[in-house]
Amino acid sequence: LEVQVPEDPVVALVGTDATLCCSFSPEPGFSLAQLNLIWQLTDTKQLVHSFAEGQDQGSAYANRTALFPDLLAQGNASLRLQRVRVADEGSFTCFVSIRDFGSAAVSLQVAAPYSKPSMTLEPNKDLRPGDTVTITCSSYRGYPEAEVFWQDGQGVPLTGNVTTSQMANEQGLFDVHSVLRVVLGANGTYSCLVRNPVLQQDAHGSVTITGQPMTFPHHHHHH
C-alpha cells in the first residue's frame, strides 16, 4: 500500500491552521470499516489522531486535529492541525492500514513574520563626526531565528562590530536585537534588514544621521 505525502515541508504561520496532506489509493470495494489510520509524531511516537473500525477515534493532540471524513473513502487521509504553535514543528507520520500498510512522514515547518524593526541610538544627542555610536535594531515575535544584515546608505554591507542576540519567549517566538557600533561620518544612513529564512520575508529599519553638529531628538528617528 503506497502512502503519499509532500516531499517538501508544509509551512504554516503561527496561529493559523495547517493541512498535513496524506493520501492512499483504495482498491475497488474498499470500505471505511477496513481502514486503520494513525497519525503520530515521528520521533516520539505520540499519537496525534486515529481512525479505526469505521469511526473517527478523535484527536489525541490537545483537540486541535481533525480528519476530512467525507474524503477518507477516496483515499484522502490528510490531517488538519488548528491554531499552529511553534511546539508543533516537526515530523508527523501517516500510517494507513487496510490489508497491507503504508506509512510516510510529512514535515511541518512553523513560521512567524518579524515586526518592522525599531531603531535606537546611544548616545542620541550632541553627536559629532568621529563619535562612536551604537545603533540598535530590534524586531519582535518571529520564527524561526532571523538573519540580520546591516548596510550603509550606499548599500555597502557593514559586517564589523555587529552583535546580534535572539531570545525566545514562552511561545517560542524570537525577539532579535542587533547592535552596530560605528564611527560617525559627516552624515549617513544605516539600515538593518531582518530576514525570516523560511518565509523569505524581509523587515527593514533605518536611521539617517545628518547635520553638524548632530542632535537626535526622538522624533528625528525614521522608522
Partner: antibody
Framework: EVQLLESGGGLVQPGGSLRLSCAAS????????MNWVRQAPGKGLEWVSG????????YYADSVQGRFTISRDNSKNTLYLQMNSLRAEDTAVYYC?????????????WGQGTLVTVSS | EIVLTQSPGTLSLSPGERATLSCRAS???????LAWYQQKPGQAPSLLIY???SRATGIPDRFSGSGSGTDFTLTISSLEPEDFAVFYC?????????FGGGTKVEIK
Amino acid sequence: EVQLLESGGGLVQPGGSLRLSCAASGFTFSSYAMNWVRQAPGKGLEWVSGISGSGGSTYYADSVQGRFTISRDNSKNTLYLQMNSLRAEDTAVYYCAKARSGYDYFFDYWGQGTLVTVSS
Amino acid sequence: EIVLTQSPGTLSLSPGERATLSCRASQRISSSFLAWYQQKPGQAPSLLIYGASSRATGIPDRFSGSGSGTDFTLTISSLEPEDFAVFYCQQYSNSPLTFGGGTKVEIK
C-alpha cells in the same frame, strides 16, 4: 530485559503443518507490533508476517499469504505462527521480532530462532 | 513491493579501515524509513540504525547511516575485529517489508 523465545520448530513433510510460538517478556507486549522473519540456510532475511499490538491487523508476505496465519494472545504474552501446506522452500530459521513501536515495523529485539525443516 | 539492492556483495577489509555499504531502493522510501542490521554467524540479527541515520541504543558511534529517497549508506568509520559480519538494510515504509540481500564484511 526484553526476551523473545521461539519454539515449535522441527522436521515436517511437504504439505504438513506446524505451529510456532514466541514467548515474550520484559516489555508491555500488547503495545508493540510483532513479526516473524525467516532465514533459509545460507541465505538472507525474509519478512514473513506481522501483527499489530491489538492483533486487529495482520500482514503477510506474498509467498505465505493464504498458508500461514499470525496471531497473538496478549494475556499470555505469546505470538504464534500457524503454518499450513508447508513447502520445501519454507525451510528456514524462523525468528520472532519485536517492532520498535506499534506502527514502526523495524525490529529492535529478536529471538534466537527456531529451525523449520520441510522435507520428505 | 520495494526491492532493496545492496552492494557490494562482499567487502574485504582490514581492521581500522573504513567500510562503506550501499543500499538502493527500487522506489522512493518515504521519510527515510530504512533500518540497518548486523548479523554474526550463528546469531540473530541486531538493530544498528533506524530512520536511515539514527543509531539504536548502545551502538557505537563508528557506525553511521545516511541517505534519503532511494540511496542509503551505512558507514563504519574504523573497523573493529567484532564488526566483521553480514549487514542487511530493511525498509519499513510499506508492506510487504523487505530486506536487502546483505553485504558480507570479511577480514582481508
